[in-house]
């Protein structure tokens, strides 16, 4: 939760209500001046101030990717990092800023038609090749509407959950991401104790369906807390 990375006061000191009188905020918020927090930074979008922990690129901003902050660092500790500009080194498309993609380890400008072919190639290759450059198609969300005209059925390759049909989510499977069923009541789910811990899963599960949450199975008593079984349960 947010609490794990925020001190408890941060959430309580919100800016005053927006858009007019209490009880009737405007439906669209006009540009507001930045709120200053300790460190004097506007909107909290600074590289070295309260980095956002992540497990996959899709959790980050559009101009970010998810990775360990230090080269060869602990794979379990990942944060959102600024995307790489043109001619910078990369290992996958998501590392490159929008309008660029990763080719031969360098961020290069993409013309959309060419990029579509590149992405499909990467997806195909990713099933059988060295996975040091996998998840290469991981995302630039602006592309998905061009790439997927129909919602993916179960087993279809996807970039994000909105590429999948209703009742499915986009989850990692081997070195690709495919549409898998959202979990139903009673099904085993994955509860991530650490942000970033599911970045290493090669068979990622979907989240629990609407009205369900992933909790420890009440009758599942085991010595080790960490190995307890979690299932999707009604709120």
């Amino acid at each position: 939760t947010l609490n794990s990375v925020l001190n408890s006061n941060a959430i309580k000191n919100l800016p005053p209500p927006l858009g007019g009188a209490a009880g009737h905020p405007g439906s669209a918020v006009s540009a507001a001046p930045g709120i200053l927090y300790p460190g004097g930074n506007k909107y909290q979008t600074i590289d070295n101030y309260q980095p956002y922990p992540c497990a996959e690129d899709e959790e980050c901003g559009t101009d970010e990717y998810c990775a360990s902050p230090t080269r060869g660092g602990d794979a379990g500790v990942q944060i959102c990092l600024a995307c790489r500009k043109r001619r910078k080194r990369c290992m996958r498309h998501a590392m490159c800023c929008p309008g660029n993609y990763c080719k031969n380890g360098i961020c290069v400008s993409s013309d959309q038609n060419h990029f579509r072919g590149e992405i499909e190639e990467t997806i195909t290759e990713s099933f059988g090749n060295d996975h040091s450059t996998l998840d290469g198609y991981s995302r630039r969300t602006t592309l998905s509407s061009k790439m997927y005209h129909t919602k993916g059925q179960e087993g279809s390759v996807c970039l994000r959950s909105s590429d999948c049909a209703s009742g499915l989510c986009c989850a990692r499977h081997f070195w690709s991401k495919i549409c898998k069923p959202v979990l139903k009541e009673g099904q085993v789910c994955t509860k991530h104790r650490r942000k970033g811990s599911h970045g290493l899963e090669i068979f990622q599960r979907c989240y629990c369906g609407e009205g369900l949450s992933c909790r420890i199975q009440k009758d599942h008593h085991q010595a080790s807390n960490s190995s307890r079984l979690h299932t999707c349960q009604r709120h």
Partner: nanobody, 129 residues
């Protein structure tokens, strides 16, 4: 025209539960964070809970952690908040809000109301002791 419409508010006894819904129309919101804020009489609006565009990330205010659960259904352009073990201090008007996926995200992005572009009209929740 973009609209967020809340429903599910009402009056309940302390310890009871309610489920709020927020339906968005006018554009797809799968690339937006959806959140709930609340405002009690005479108080400032405060952050309650948010769910990110990636579905897997939820954030809660300390005061509701473990009691409220936020979720969303992108296919229906709807966000939900299940509220259990309600307390009199949860009494407020609850607003649904949507914030676009930013270029850079930070831990405070989700709780900062100025990041939210779209707001609903609110739904009243009253918890009596």
């Amino acid at each position: 025209e973009v609209q967020l419409v809340e429903s599910g508010g009402g009056s309940v006894q302390a310890g009871g539960s309610l489920r709020l819904s927020c339906t968005a129309s006018g554009r797809p919101f799968d690339n937006y964070a959806m959140a709930w804020f609340r405002q009690a009489p005479g108080k400032e609006r405060e952050f309650v809970a948010a769910i990110s565009w990636s579905l897997s990330r939820t954030h809660y205010a300390d005061s509701v952690e473990g009691r409220f659960t936020i979720s969303r259904d992108n296919a229906k352009n709807t966000a939900f908040m299940q509220m259990i073990s309600l307390k009199p201090e949860d009494t407020a008007v609850y607003y649904c809000a949507a914030a676009p996926r930013p270029k850079r995200v930070s831990v405070r992005y989700f709780s900062t109301s100025s990041n939210y572009d779209y707001w609903g009209q609110g739904t009243q929740v009253t918890v009596s002791s």
